[in-house]
């Protein structure tokens, strides 16, 4: 057959769907690979062809669009399952072609099972709510396009294994779940089950997301450097190891990049000749406030090194701060036998 632009297996689009539920899967060609949409392609005389390779098989085969009740169908650039079966798992390919043009891409589809607590191998999206921030909502995700607006589905919300009813601060409101005042106790997995009729049949869509309650922007502050500080002096003799921790607290800020770095005499450690290593550790509070510690280490410090300026810097979306460490050379202790004896007038 003639050459075809093969975009390979698009593993970035690892699509997971629940068994026995409808699934609508758009051909990724138009979303990620080509500069035109399906309508343009169709009006230019291009045809979209679907085929698949079953799990643990090498053989590409056409998709059977003649199953009872049109269980699998294609509509424009969407492949529909109404509903999926476990053995629909495999690699699916959509190919756009005419006599002179051909482009195709494959993607993996995994049909997964869930239990009655909605546990499954499905990768869950995370929705962050601000702690004690007033009313916030989550919306049942990825249900657009499954039924027309004239259809009024039923929506049932669950937290973990439990149907949400009579919860103190969590109220189901159709496709939305409202948190009157989010608390740490609201952390967990939330599931919406959307049930709707279509052509005399009834379908369920199950969507689970993880809610994580995080620090509120109302309480956010610029980075706080706990160490170095004015109370600790790093007093070393030449040849000793110099260890200076820079410990910085960052309030949680959505989409903020938290940065910590050292400068030595105003330069980044990479830009100077001394043998310095920096180790970083990060810890998080329950509300995702972050504490970063960068330990600056010089194995065998010289008297020159002890005269340098060591400054810890920190930056977040809330601002930038810096703090110099107090480093000095240790004054040698007096030698007892000679100096003290002289003091007593010994000859």
């Amino acid at each position: 057959s003639e050459r075809c632009d093969d975009w390979g297996l698009d593993t970035m689009r690892q699509i997971q769907v629940f068994e026995d539920e409808p699934a609508r899967i758009k051909c990724p060609l138009f979303e990620h690979f080509l500069k035109f949409n399906y309508s343009t392609a169709h009006s230019a005389g291009l045809t979209l062809i679907w085929y698949w390779t079953r799990q643990d098989r090498d053989l590409e085969e056409p998709i059977n669009f003649r199953l009872p009740e049109n269980r699998i169908s294609k509509e424009k650039d969407v492949l529909w399952f109404r509903p999926t079966l476990l053995n629909d798992t495999g690699n699916y390919t959509c190919m756009l072609r005419n006599t002179t043009y051909c482009s195709k891409v494959a993607f993996p589809l995994e049909v997964v099972q869930k239990d009655s607590c909605f546990n499954s191998p499905m990768k869950l999206p995370v929705h962050k709510l601000y702690i004690e921030y007033g009313i916030q909502r989550i919306t049942c995700p990825n249900v657009d396009g499954y039924f027309p607006s004239s259809v009024k589905p039923t929506i049932t919300w669950y937290m973990g294994c439990y149907k949400i009813q009579n919860f103190n601060n969590v109220i189901p409101e159709g496709m939305n779940l409202s948190f009157l005042i989010a608390l740490i106790s609201n952390n967990g997995n939330y599931t919406c089950v959307v049930t709707y009729p279509e052509n005399g049949r009834t379908f369920h869509l199950t969507r689970t997301l993880t809610v994580k309650v995080v620090g509120s922007p109302k309480n956010a502050v610029p980075p706080v450097i706990h160490s170095p500080n004015d109370h600790v002096v790093y007093e070393k003799e030449p040849g000793e190891e110099l260890l200076i921790p820079c410990t910085v607290y960052f309030s949680f800020l959505m989409d903020s990049r938290n940065e910590v770095w050292w400068t030595i005499d105003g330069k980044k450690p990479d830009d100077i000749t001394i043998d310095v290593t920096i180790n970083e550790s990060i810890s998080h509070s329950r509300t995702e406030d972050e504490t970063r510690t960068q330990i600056l280490s010089i194995k065998k410090v010289t008297s020159e090194d002890l005269k340098r300026s060591y400054v810890c810097h920190a930056r977040s979306a809330k601002g930038e701060v810096a703090k110099a460490a107090k480093v000095k050379q240790k004054v040698p202790a007096p030698r007892y036998t000679v100096e003290l004896a002289c003091g007593f007038g010994a000859t």
Partner: antibody, heavy 117, light 107 residues
């Protein structure tokens, strides 16, 4: 094909207990909740409670809280409803029903429990 | 517990008649009402869920409407196989509760 097959009719003495079983087939047992509903002769339906087979958690109608126990055995795909301290007004047909997303779509055939001295 | 009051408790009708059964909840239950059909000696069968959605395979002559506290089941043209008892139930909050049932008999 989804099926819920219940145990046979029982005649019990007042004060005794009854345990009704509901064997599920045609689907993954621990993907759905099982509810129990009863119907006294010539009366309406009365919800007794449910069991979540994954967590083992059961929720009961307070009217029965001290007398009813709903359990599930995942290894045999069977749900159970045990009612103790039986009285004559417990004479009813007991149904198990599979629920998902608030839909009671599949029901067992019912088990008649007669309480008589 | 939420009370579900169903009326009438029984009615007589002929094939082809339009039949309406109502159910009143003692509290707001949103759209969380289901309707079931039950024939003598048989288990209930789901007809309507979410107040107005027909379950799989249910004929279009059955329709449901209402929200909050007032709900209606309508059979637009009664068929011989429709003579049965109909139950409404609120699936909104535990304990789930049902109406007393409406028996539809042949006139």
């Amino acid at each position: 094909e989804v099926q819920l097959v219940q145990s046979g009719a029982e005649v019990k003495k007042p004060g005794s207990s009854v345990k009704v079983s509901c064997k599920a087939s045609g689907y993954t047992f621990n993907s759905y909740w099982i509810h129990w509903v009863r119907q006294a002769p010539g009366q309406g339906l009365e919800w007794m409670g449910y069991n979540n087979p994954t967590s083992g958690y059961s929720e009961y109608n307070q009217k029965f809280t001290d007398r009813v126990t709903i359990t599930a055995d995942k290894s045999t795909s069977t749900a159970y409803m045990e009612l103790s301290s039986l009285r004559s007004e417990d004479t009813a047909v007991y149904y198990c029903a599979r629920e998902y997303g608030d839909l009671f779509a599949y029901w067992g055939q019912g088990t008649l429990v007669t309480v008589s001295s | 517990a939420i009370q579900m009051t169903q009326s009438p408790s029984s009615l007589s009708a002929s094939v082809g008649d339009r039949v309406t059964i109502t159910c009143k909840a003692s509290e707001n239950v949103g759209y969380s009402v289901s309707w079931f059909q039950q024939k003598p000696g048989k288990s209930p069968k789901l007809l309507i869920y979410g107040a107005s959605n027909r379950y799989t395979g249910v004929p279009s002559r059955f329709s449901g409407s209402g929200s909050a506290t007032d709900f209606t089941l309508t059979i637009s043209s009664l068929q011989p196989e429709d003579f049965a008892t109909y139950h409404c139930g609120q699936i909104y909050i535990y304990p789930y509760t049902f109406g007393g049932g409406t028996k539809v008999e042949i006139k």
